[in-house]
């Protein structure tokens, strides 16, 4: 089948990194600088993406693959293929329309991006607060108060924290 197809269409023999040059009797020509073809049999090479402005190059363009961009320091990617850059904030903050703002009491953000999320409500699982929450960290839930009563022979390990964003206050 491959042989038949190549007899019908000489371009099918052109590998990735080349294009089928109609101006040169359908010879496989290398992609020009700043262009690529990621599959064989292409009649043109695609132009490489430029990582300029707030974007910077994460992976250089090659003859067989496009460039990949990320964001300059102090920013992080949003959208498919890093199609927008958003300012980082500090842990314990969230980005608002007025810039980076500290998390309100009872919420936290342990990353440089995203929103402040409510602390886990330990009592929903019958647990007690072992370590208080901060702007940067969720609370750590410990054993239930009953487990800590005199005569209790063992202490249950801390339960994994629920997804804080899903916990009602």
């Amino acid at each position: 089948f491959e042989r038949t197809r190549s007899l019908q269409d000489p371009c099918s023999n052109c590998p990735a990194g080349t294009f089928c040059d109609n101006n040169r009797n359908q010879i496989c020509s290398p992609c020009p600088p700043n262009s690529f073809s990621s599959a064989g049999g292409q009649r043109t090479c695609d132009i490489c993406r430029q990582c300029k402005g707030v974007f910077r190059t994460r992976k250089e363009c090659s003859s067989t693959s496009n460039a990949e961009c990320d964001c300059t320091p102090g920013f992080h990617c949003l959208g498919a293929g890093c199609s927008m850059c958003e300012q980082d904030c500090k842990q314990g903050q969230e980005l608002t329309k007025k810039g980076c703002k500290d998390c309100c009491f009872g919420t936290f953000n342990d990353q440089k991006r995203g929103i402040c999320r409510p602390w886990t409500n330990c009592s929903l699982d019958g647990k007690s607060v072992l370590v208080n929450g901060t702007k940067e960290r969720d609370v750590v839930c410990g054993p239930s108060p009953a487990d800590l009563s005199p005569g209790a022979s063992s202490v249950t390990p801390p339960a994994p924290a629920r997804e804080p964003g899903h916990s009602p206050q």
Epitope: G79, A80, S83, M84, Q87
Partner: antibody, heavy 115, light 107 residues
Framework: QVQLQQWGAGLLKPSETLSLTCAVY????????WSWIRQPPGKGLEWIGE???????DSNPSLKGRVTFSVDTSKNQFSLKLNSVTAADTAVYYC?????????WGQGTLVTVSS | EIVMTQSPATLSVSPGERATLSCRAS??????LAWYQQKPGQAPRLLIY???TRATGIPARFSGSGSGTEFTLTISSLQSEDFAVYYC?????????FGGGTKVEIK
Amino acid sequence: QVQLQQWGAGLLKPSETLSLTCAVYGGSFSGYYWSWIRQPPGKGLEWIGEIQHSGSTDSNPSLKGRVTFSVDTSKNQFSLKLNSVTAADTAVYYCARLTGPFDYWGQGTLVTVSS
Amino acid sequence: EIVMTQSPATLSVSPGERATLSCRASQSISSILAWYQQKPGQAPRLLIYGASTRATGIPARFSGSGSGTEFTLTISSLQSEDFAVYYCQQYYNWPLTFGGGTKVEIK
């Protein structure tokens, strides 16, 4: 709320230099790239160029080196100069923040070039 | 430079109807495309980036699709405030370029 406020001379004679300034209020100034875009009356949008808070610039080759950008980080302001203007430079000029797309825009300044 | 072509130049639609706007790039730009809305006497407003991601505060009736060279902006049910001019813009390659715009007018 990030706001961009721009100003500059609205009426110029041919061969004069267009000069516009854009001030950024709210949000951060450093790290971002700040752009100028123009729109001739009743027409589409044309990107003029951009400047980063550090001073690095890029501009549209169609303007053939007539354009100069500057930045004043102490005032959170950036400026555009376009020399040797002609009637073809008559347009509404916008400043905008560049985060990939242009996510915040100034109100626009109509610049008319007429003898 | 990458040339962006929008069609149609004018689209006449009744309120409540669906509007479909097209944008074509002269070369593949992956999904590195934005859509803007511009009303008379106002600056453009970012609607969509990355071809399909709605910008902050943009209603769900606006949606973007496409990749490579063919892109679409769909307004599912036109409201009175949606009658405006819409521009696509590529930021895949410099110089940054815009389409010529599609005016969405009341039928």
